[in-house]
Interface confidence: medium
């Protein structure tokens, strides 16, 4: 999901070019300042650089590029605006460099960007036209592919007094410009739920990892349209329990498995349905792992051995008869 | 024959300023990144500035960020420093250097030095 | 900012005979490919002159007595066989990151 490229292609020797010929432009092939650059694999490495912006110098023909682990910061409009244009640029991988802000039109005029990886920066500030490059209700289709987002979120005293969710799913959907999106990866960002337009808004999608956050449940949430699903990955989440309408709406998608591990399940009355669900579907992944956290009493089991005479609700007591 | 000879130098009385400048010569000048790195009297070397082949990107040295200018014009083959608010603690021998295309191969030539002393 | 730590501060070496130079970087100047450290020497009254580029490559024209090598935090130069010619400062010198820093410096000395 991200560039990548053997270490073996980077050539370990260049020529010194130490021509007194006539004057010549720059060399296209050169490689920019604390990079590393191969032509065969077009492909350049500023990795660990501590770079504080993207180097204005990048050469024509790179088609991966690796910025992971620098201190950029900000990533301003046009921050890989080239002329010409960087026309080849298909990958580029971002991770870990510190980026606390994307404005609007970051990764405008990269024609053919497939592949995008923002995971771990604390992006307190994306812009809604992060990804679509303009305001407009429509926008020209992006070319992404697969954007991974995993760990994106900021520190809680770094965060916009605005919802995260909110505002990532703002730069998702604004100007529709995503409806090409096949991969989309956001574990690890402590959402607490999944705004329900976002995924009717994404139908190309194949690939959809929500692992790692904190979503209590999928009531709202419809993936009806998502007819392509081939995965979705809720594992390490707080979910109770997966209700019918989801459950059928899972069940009706054509080539999907769903990753459910590591979650609270809670095997009262309420999970009969998911329990009788489960053994039957073929679509959950490892489902013979899944097992109940709570009530107290069924810690461990394990859902596809459970049967309704297991699961019970306490009876809800009249109120003259609660206590506080 | 690739040679680098830098000039400019000389006696300044503290917060004034001085341009210094290095002509490169033998090589393709426009092809090469050009650093300014500075020796002060009896010291180790310390790097300054660096410039890219087409004045696209530049970096500086903490100690001298905001205070010194790196340029260059590719049509006179010649690379500058320009230096404001000088301060006795830039008292040394600057020297310009060249970068080969790939950075991963150190400064390959080095021109002969020119000497600032900044005092009152 | 990277540390380079040069050992030793001075040397004295019999002509002929083998001397060895340390530089030990605060963080690792190498990625999976190449190393960013090189070596320079520099006369008196002379600026200085690179001999070793990416750890080990010996810059054209430089005599075959020296070498270079290490990777990460770790490098040495070395000459096989010191003649009276080497005398001077050499320095070790990364372009892993801004700012490129230098090594104090190690003073080659005939006995």
């Known amino acids: 999901s991200s560039p990548t490229s053997s270490a073996s292609s980077f050539s370990s020797s260049a020529p010194f070019l130490a021509s007194a010929v006539s004057a010549q432009p720059p060399l296209p092939d050169q490689c920019p300042a604390l990079c590393e650059c191969s032509e065969a694999a077009r492909t350049v490495k500023c990795v660990n650089r501590n770079l504080t912006e993207v180097p204005t110098d990048l050469p024509a023909y790179v088609r991966n590029l690796f910025l992971t682990g620098n201190q950029l910061a900000v990533l301003p409009a046009g921050a890989f605006a080239r002329r010409p244009p960087l026309a080849e640029l298909a990958a580029l991988n971002l991770s870990g460099s510190r980026l606390d802000e994307v404005r609007a039109g970051a990764f405008e005029h990269l024609p053919s960007l497939r592949q995008l990886d923002l995971s771990h920066n604390p992006l307190a500030d994306l812009s809604p036209f992060a990804f679509s490059g303009s305001n407009a209700s429509v926008s020209a289709p992006s070319p992404l592919v697969e954007l991974i987002l995993n760990h994106i979120v900021p520190p809680e005293d770094e965060r916009q007094n605005r919802s995260f969710e909110g505002m990532v799913v703002a730069a998702l959907l604004a100007g529709r410009a995503l409806q090409g999106l096949r991969r989309l990866e956001l574990a690890s960002n402590h959402f607490l739920y999944l705004p329900r337009d976002v995924l009717a808004q994404l139908p190309s999608l194949r690939h959809l990892d929500l692992s790692n956050n904190s979503l209590v449940s999928l009531t709202y949430v419809s993936f009806r349209n998502l007819t392509h699903l081939e995965s979705l990955h809720l594992e390490d989440n707080a979910l109770k329990v997966l209700h019918n309408g989801t459950l059928a709406e899972l069940q009706g998608l054509p080539h999907i498995r769903v990753f459910l591990d590591n979650n609270p399940w809670v095997c009262d009355c309420h999970m009969a349905d998911m329990v009788t669900w489960l053994k039957e579907t073929e679509v959950v992944q490892g489902k013979d792992r899944l097992t109940c956290a709570y009530p107290e009493k069924m810690r461990n089991r394990v859902l596809l051995e459970l049967n309704s005479a297991d699961l019970d609700c306490d009876p809800i007591l009249p109120p003259s008869l609660q206590t506080s | 024959e690739v040679q680098l000879v830098e000039s400019g130098g000389g006696v300044v009385q503290p917060g004034r300023s001085l341009r210094l400048s290095c002509a490169a010569s033998g090589f393709t000048f426009s092809n090469f990144g050009m650093h300014w790195v500075r020796q002060a009297p009896g010291k180790g070397l310390e790097w300054v500035a660096y410039i890219s082949s087409g004045s696209s990107t530049f970096y500086y040295a903490d100690s001298v960020k905001g205070r010194f200018t790196i340029s260059r014009d590719n049509s006179k083959n010649t690379l500058y420093l320009q230096m404001n608010s000088l301060r006795a603690e830039d008292t040394a021998v600057y020297f310009c250097?060249?970068?080969?295309?790939?950075?991963?191969?150190?400064?390959?030539?080095w021109g002969q030095g020119t000497t600032v002393t900044v005092s009152s | 900012d990277i540390v380079l730590t040069q050992t030793p501060l001075s040397l004295s070496v019999t002509p002929g005979q083998p001397a060895s130079i340390s530089c030990r970087a605060s963080q690792s100047v190498s990625s999976s490919t190449f190393s960013y450290m090189h070596w320079y020497q520099q006369k008196p009254g002379q600026p200085p002159q690179l001999l070793i580029k990416?750890?080990?490559n010996l810059e054209s024209g430089v005599p075959d007595r020296f070498s270079g090598s290490g990777s990460g935090t770790d490098f040495t130069l070395k000459i096989s066989r010191v003649e009276a010619e080497d005398v001077g400062v050499y320095y070790c010198q990364h372009s892993w990151e801004i700012p490129y820093t230098f090594g104090g410096g190690t003073k080659v000395e005939i006995k």
């Open positions: 250097a060249r970068s080969p295309a790939y950075y991963r191969y150190g400064l390959d030539y």
């Open positions: 990416s750890s080990s």
